[in-house]
């Protein structure tokens, strides 16, 4: 079975939360849910509320954790300027990190005189309703789960290209005489809570995770 990514590309470290009492709410809700034989979790999908049964232990499996997936009762903190942030992702479960910031810098942290070949932008996406799973099938993503009257929203930390052509001839710093170049968004798969019929289930879904430069030779170079 494929593994969800455990790290985020260098320069796009996801800032760790300030630990607040919010972090305990999901733990508490799960503890209570565990005491019941079958926990009823109301999942709101595309504006509808359905009662579905979820095994709370699903949230405790370490292999499911990805720093790019967050369950939170409130939106991750938005940071106007994240160039100064240099936090590392801690070992806590994704649903414990409730205050990670939105990253919207044009490229990762560089020393003076260094540039990115492609510019990327990273944001927390909290309104994902559908996604493509690892088998290429479109699946319904759970936007919110209601556990013991606490509504937890599912957020995804996505990174994509700001522009396919950071300079008008393609990627930055490429010899445009001999090379074609353009920036493109690449993807990875993360475990997310999705709807499987009437049940909530963890599935690998595809999300945008990086911006890379694609090169191909000019014919004049080949000739």
């Amino acid at each position: 079975e494929p593994h969800s990514e455990s790290n985020v590309p260098a320069g796009h470290t996801i800032p760790q939360a300030h630990w607040t009492k919010l972090q305990h709410s999901l733990d508490t809700a799960l503890r209570r849910a565990r005491s019941a034989p079958a926990a009823a979790i109301a999942a709101r999908v595309a504006g509808q509320t359905r009662n579905i049964t979820v095994d709370p232990r699903l949230f405790k499996k370490r292999r499911l954790r990805s720093p790019r997936v967050l369950f939170s009762t409130q939106p991750p903190r938005e940071a106007a300027d994240t160039q100064d942030l240099d936090f590392e992702v801690g070992g806590a479960a994704p649903f414990n990190r409730t205050h990670r910031s939105k990253r919207s810098s044009s490229h990762p942290i560089f020393h003076r005189g260094e540039f990115s070949v492609c510019d990327s932008v990273s944001v927390w996406v909290g309104d994902k309703t559908t996604a493509t799973d690892i088998k290429g099938k479109e699946v319904m993503v759970l936007g919110e789960v209601n556990i013991n009257n606490s509504v937890f929203k599912q957020y995804f930390f996505e990174t994509k290209c700001r522009d396919p052509n950071p300079v008008d001839s393609g990627c930055r710093g490429i010899d445009s005489k001999h090379w074609n170049s353009y920036c493109t968004t690449t993807h990875t798969f993360v475990k997310a809570l999705t709807m499987d019929g009437k049940q909530a289930a963890w599935r690998f879904i595809r999300i945008d995770t990086a911006c890379v430069c694609v090169l191909s030779r000019k014919a004049v170079r080949r000739a």
Partner: antibody
């Protein structure tokens, strides 16, 4: 937005020369190969040659090598195609086209310049 | 030089029809195959680059496929504005070469 504007139609006698211009705007002129292509009446497209305005480097097809000269003027963002020793079979619409970033495709084309060679 | 054999040279079709044009290079061009649309009095337009990638602003009814020495342009549902001449072009090596064109006419 990117635009390529070519000079007007020309009528020339066999043996003469013609110089067609292609003025570019809306992008970094020096960083893209400019291609020249022609189309004889009722025929397909034929590649003539290319120039890289950044350093003036050129490539020509064997069919016109020695008769075609491509030049670029960075100050006016204009490329020129001069064809000498004209023959009747050079009668065609001449196009300039920018080679883009993708698979050596031509993403913007000029409107074309009709060159008629007739005695 | 790489020869590009395009077929058919012309075809008659109605609005809503599915249209397929093929292009066969004389040697493997590694997917460096582009398709253009030409209309009288208009500038030539790039439709598809690198065999199957839709150029910006081109309607999704246009699609391309193929590999090696066999490539296809498909218009899934012909629209009135699609009546034009279509050319294939190999961007693999110099000299660049083109197909002879396919004129799509109204039936």
């Amino acid at each position: 937005q990117v635009q390529l504007v070519q000079s007007g139609a020309e009528v020339k006698k066999p043996g003469a020369s013609v110089k067609v211009s292609c003025k570019a705007s809306g992008y970094t002129f020096s960083r893209y190969w400019m291609q020249w292509i022609r189309q004889a009446p009722g025929q397909g497209l034929e590649w003539i040659g290319a120039i890289y305005p950044g350093d003036g480097d050129t490539r020509y097809s064997q069919r016109v090598k020695g008769r075609a000269t491509l030049t670029a003027d960075q100050s006016t963002s204009t490329v020129y195609m001069e064809l000498s020793s004209l023959r009747s079979e050079d009668t065609a619409v001449y196009y300039c086209a920018r080679e883009g970033n993708f698979a050596n495709s031509f993403d913007y084309w000029g409107q074309g310049t009709l060159v008629t060679v007739s005695s | 030089d790489i020869q590009m054999t395009q077929s058919p040279s012309s075809l008659s079709a109605s609005v809503g029809d599915r249209v397929t044009i093929t292009c066969r290079p004389s040697q493997d061009i590694g997917n460096h195959l582009n398709w253009y649309q030409q209309k009288p009095g208009k500038t030539v337009k790039l439709l598809i680059y690198f065999t199957s990638r839709l150029y910006s602003g081109v309607p999704s009814r246009f699609s391309g496929s193929g590999s090696g020495t066999d490539y296809t342009l498909t218009i899934s549902s012909l629209q009135p504005e699609d009546f034009a001449t279509y050319f294939c072009h190999q961007g693999y090596t110099l000299p660049y070469t083109f197909g002879q064109g396919t004129k799509v006419e109204i039936k």
